[in-house]
């Protein structure tokens, strides 16, 4: 069976084809080659000499037991080599020779027992080394690591490392890899010698499910003393053994580390006294809790120095009353618990993501809700009922506002967005908004993107609601049950580039409303019920138009619509997916491509 | 279409068939077997994925006695610092994991429940596997 040609001469997918040897019928120019799940078993010298341009080679699960000297010798351009799931028993000292450009080496689940005799010391370009899910017992980084000056990621997770000694990291003292991210998760650790990490600098250290008791965790964290780490990730996994006890003493040792960003990722334990628990983390710049259960989050001190707080997929007793002086970014998403938003006091806040929490807002939106006048980004999407009762007083700096898939109330009672002269992006898609007030978008003089799909309009008519949106470049009015539009609805939108009118209920097409759209490039009228033109004589669309989508409409391929069908043919160079433009009537022409019809008035005879 | 039996409990019988053409082997054990009136137990999965499990989610299509419920999307792996350790599993890496589950107080009517589980993962998104579970429920059986 032949390989699948994904990109001609470049990418070939030969997965699970029962190949016993490397195929020799692929182009020399091949850059990406997937040979995974083939029983190759043995790689001899120059196994890949036919592919000198190769950049990515996937040999996952190829039952490889032996890799000989120079197996990859010809692959000087190879940047990624994947060996996952091969039961390697014999790895020659020169197995990886010739890989002068290799940046990523994945040797996950390859029976690797030690880093010491892994022959990669010459791979100077290596950026990522993944040796997870192996049999490595010692964390001693061999001397050859001093050659790997570009190494950024070292994944040693799911190995058998139990202890870390001062001598294990000696090589990092000789040449500090300032950007190294190290994952030691799922190693059964019980001892870290104090001083082992002293004066070591890491970009990221991940320790999840490493400790089988609170005491072990405490002593191991104390063993990290002196470490300077940009991002520290601690925690557990839901499907692994979890700590039976967790209290404020667990993280005391973190006071002896220098941490820029901290994340606690999944904890099968109910946290209550969080102010004491995170006592050593009051001055990290970014603090993150993922999948953690917390009863009270009103105990964070106003003085905590966090600039970014992230609470994701957590469970709360009630919405947290957050009062934090320095906070600039708050990400609070996909959480459960407190269903009603309550005021926060975040005077420095610029970025706020409150999406996907099922929250209801008794009132929205004012500076008093968030305690800031600096807010630039606000995402309230995928929440519950949001009652619009203030027009963003004090929030005039907003540039990005997203309400999609929340239920907006009182949208047509006043000019909700009147204060938002700096707003660039607004998404009110699928918000149950019924437009019954022409001033709905008053004030949005800087708006560039407006998404309002899945809403409705009074009498299914689009009125002149965009008159102030002179900078608009993108407008989505799809799924709005529209049947008609004002001939002047788009007259002020001279910058508009993309207009989506798909999935509405238009029965005819008219070019007149688009005459002022001098910048229009994309017009989507797919999934309507267009049968014909509104007027007999259709004018041209703006000359800027490059893509016109009329697919999945109800074209009437009858004599009386001959001029419309001819007009469509004349627009051929603009039309996209023409094969999906089919006749709906008459029944004998149903399903026929509109453009393949011979339009003569013999059609209906 | 070959049917794979999972287990029987006091009120349910569970089996599955593949609904994709690949039919890559997957081993599923439930201990103790699910009782629909209330249940607590361990789901054990042994599987060698044909693509990375990063950003894994399930599309669930549930049918209750021929009535179709709306499609549900269950995100399992968000892509970083995920809840489950298998979210970091790579294509070709053995996934051998045990997941605890519990639910209670759901009253199911007697009948045939079908659940099509479409597992989607990776970037670009592609189907990992598709299984159709059939649960025969007899509330009063011993």
């Amino acid at each position: 069976e032949p390989c699948v040609e994904v990109v001609p001469n470049i990418t070939y997918q030969c997965m699970e084809l029962n190949f016993y040897k490397i195929p020799d019928n692929l182009p020399f120019s091949t850059k990406n080659l997937d040979l995974s799940f083939n029983p190759l078993r043995h790689l001899g010298s120059y196994s890949f000499f036919s592919f000198p341009e190769l950049q990515v080679l996937d040999l996952s699960r190829c039952e490889i037991q032996t890799i000989e000297d120079g197996a990859y010798q010809s692959l000087s351009h190879l940047s990624t080599l994947i060996l996952t799931g091969n039961p390697i028993q014999s790895l020659a000292l020169g197995a990886f020779s010739g890989l002068s450009s290799l940046q990523k080496l994945v040797a996950v689940e390859t029976n690797l027992a030690s880093l010491e005799n892994f022959p990669i010391g010459h791979l100077k370009t290596l950026k990522e080394l993944n040796v997870a899910h192996n049999l490595i017992q010692s964390f001693k980084l061999p001397e050859y690591f001093s050659n790997l000056t570009n190494l950024e990621h070292l994944d040693l997770s799911s190995n058998k490392i139990q202890s870390i000694y001062c001598t294990d990291l000696r090589v990092l003292h000789q040449m500090p890899l300032l950007n190294l991210s190290l994952d030691l998760s799922l190693n059964p650790m019980n001892f870290i010698q104090p001083g082992a990490f002293k004066e070591i600098r890491l970009h990221k250290l991940t320790l999840r499910n490493n400790f089988d008791s609170l005491n072990v965790m405490k002593t191991c964290i104390q063993g990290l003393a002196g470490l300077e780490v940009h991002r520290l990730v601690l925690g557990e996994f839901r499907n692994e053994g979890n700590l039976e006890k967790f209290d404020k003493s667990a993280l005391e040792g973190l006071c002896n580390l220098t941490i820029e960003e901290f994340r606690l990722a999944y904890l099968d334990y109910y946290l209550d006294d969080i102010i004491d628990l995170f006592n050593c983390l009051t001055n990290v710049s970014s603090f993150s809790l993922v999948s953690v259960t917390i009863e009270r989050v009103k105990d964070f001190s106003y003085n905590f120095g966090w600039q970014h707080l992230e609470l994701v997929n957590c469970k709360f007793g009630q919405f947290p009353t957050l009062k934090l002086k320095s906070l600039k970014r708050l990400t609070f998403t996909s959480n459960k618990g407190g269903n009603a938003f309550s005021e926060v006091d975040l005077p420095s806040l610029e970025f706020l993501d409150l999406s996907r929490n099922g929250l209801s807002f008794k009132g929205c939106c004012s500076q008093s809700d968030f305690g800031t006048t600096s807010l630039k980004y606000l995402d309230l999407s995928f929440n519950g009922v949001i009652t619009m009762s203030s027009n963003f007083l004090g929030l005039e700096q907003l540039e990005h506002l997203d309400f999609q898939h929340s239920n907006l109330k009182q949208m047509s009672e006043f000019s909700v967005f009147l204060s938002l002269r700096n707003l660039i992006y607004l998404d009110i898609s699928h918000t149950h908004t019924r437009v019954a007030f022409n001033g709905i978008f008053n004030g949005l003089s800087s708006l560039e993107v407006l998404k309002m799909a899945g809403n409705s309009f009074q009498e299914n008519f689009l009125p002149d609601i965009f008159t102030e949106l002179r900078n608009l470049t993108f407008l989505d009015l799809s799924q709005c049950q529209l049947e008609q539009l004002s001939p002047t609805a788009f007259n002020s939108l001279s910058s508009l580039q993309v207009l989506n009118m798909s999935h509405n209920n238009f029965f005819s097409l008219d070019t007149f409303p688009y005459k002022c759209l001098n910048s229009l490039q994309v017009l989507d009228y797919s999934l309507n019920h267009i049968m014909t033109s509104k007027k007999q004589e259709l004018q041209h669309f703006p000359s800027s138009l490059a893509f016109l989508n009329l697919t999945q409409n109800d074209f009437a391929c009858t004599c009386e619509h001959q001029s419309f069908l001819q007009w469509i043919k004349d627009q051929r160079q603009l039309l996209v997916e023409v094969e999906r433009m089919e006749c709906a009537t008459p029944s004998d022409k149903q399903g026929m491509p509109v453009l393949s019809l011979n339009i003569t008035c013999q059609m209906n005879k | 279409q070959k049917q794979y039996w999972v287990c029987n409990s006091s009120d349910a019988s569970i089996s599955y068939t593949y609904c994709d053409k690949m039919q890559y082997p997957i081993s599923i054990n439930v201990n103790p077997c699910i009782e629909l009136k209330r249940s607590k137990g361990l789901l054990h999965i042994f599987y060698i994925p044909r693509r990375d499990l990063k950003q894994l989610y399930f599309n669930l299509y549930i049918t209750v006695n021929t009535m179709n419920l709306p499609k549900r999307k269950e995100v399992i792996c968000r892509g970083s610092d995920d809840d489950y350790s298998f979210c970091r599993a790579l294509k070709g890496e053995t996934v051998n994991t045990t997941i605890s589950f519990s639910f209670k107080g759901i009253k199911f009517s007697k009948g045939k429940y079908k659940c099509v589980v479409e597992a989607i993962s990776g970037s670009p998104e592609e189907m990992l596997f598709c299984l159709e579970f059939v649960i025969l429920h007899q509330p009063n059986s011993n």
Epitope: Y302, T321, E343, G363 | -
Partner: antibody, heavy 118, light 107 residues
Framework: QVQLQESGPGLVKPSDTLSLTCAVS?????????WHWIRQPPGKGLEWMGY???????DFNPSLKTRITISRDTSKNQFSLKLSSVTAVDTAVYYC???????????WGQGTLVTVSS | EIVLTQSPDFQSVTPKEKVTITCRAS??????LHWYQQKPDQSPKLLIK???HAISGVPSRFSGSGSGTDFTLTINSLEAEDAATYYC?????????FGGGTKVEIK
């Protein structure tokens, strides 16, 4: 500059309903914040009574819940307090105030004394 | 509800002297505590929020400290115009509550 001004009768009979109004200038009561009533019996401390949010939502001190109503007139930019079935212990200086998100009160009216007496 | 206990109830102090007023909460309220000054026949005036953050325009001799359950308001060098009653307020949870007050008198 936000200013608050209480007004209403200074004398109310026992069992009657006490009614006060707070006129706000310098800020719209529908524009943001929550608007509160706080009272202070002569020679005693301060007691928080309840509030009306800019959205119209109200909440009260549990000790007064059965007797208190707070409403607003947005056209006049004012909010009102009604306290039913008053007794002598309701004699106090009544303040209206605006709360900020810290849950502190930076803006207060000057207060109005209401005496409950027959 | 959170009960705030102020002490002392009354303090008579000579000018330029240091005044210390304490406020104890019945449960931990982090640093969500505010201080007010009320002069006779006037409405209260916010002095300090979040235990230690002075409000702009408030003289620098006023300072606050504390966290959890124990809080202190300090007037470093008392002046005649500081004669007033001082109240602490719980800003942690509803119902909002005030301390009983501390009356500071000039000797």
């Amino acid at each position: 500059q936000v200013q608050l001004q209480e007004s209403g009768p200074g004398l109310v009979k026992p069992s009657d309903t006490l009614s006060l109004t707070c006129a706000v200038s310098g800020y719209s009561i529908t524009g943001g914040y929550s608007w509160h009533w706080i009272r202070q019996p002569p020679g005693k401390g301060l007691e928080w009574m309840g509030y009306i949010h800019y959205s119209g939502y109200t909440d009260f001190n549990p000790s007064l819940k059965t007797r208190i109503t707070i409403s607003r007139d947005t056209s006049k930019n004012q909010f009102s307090l009604k306290l039913s079935s008053v007794t002598a212990v309701d004699t106090a200086v009544y303040y209206c105030a605006r709360k900020d998100p810290s849950d502190a009160f930076p803006y207060w009216g000057q207060g109005t004394l209401v005496t409950v007496s027959s | 509800e959170i009960v705030l206990t102020q002490s002392p109830d009354f303090q008579s102090v000579t000018p330029k002297e240091k005044v210390t007023i304490t406020c104890r909460a019945s449960q931990s309220i982090s640093d969500h505590l505010h201080w007010y000054q009320q002069k006779p026949d006037q409405s209260p005036k916010l002095l300090i929020k979040y235990a230690s953050h002075a409000i702009s325009g408030v003289p620098s001799r006023f300072s606050g400290s504390g966290s959890g359950t124990d809080f202190t308001l300090t007037i470093n060098s008392l002046e005649a115009e500081d004669a007033a009653t001082y109240y602490c307020q719980n800003g942690h949870s509803f119902p909002l509550t005030f301390g009983g007050g501390t009356k500071v008198e000039i000797k």
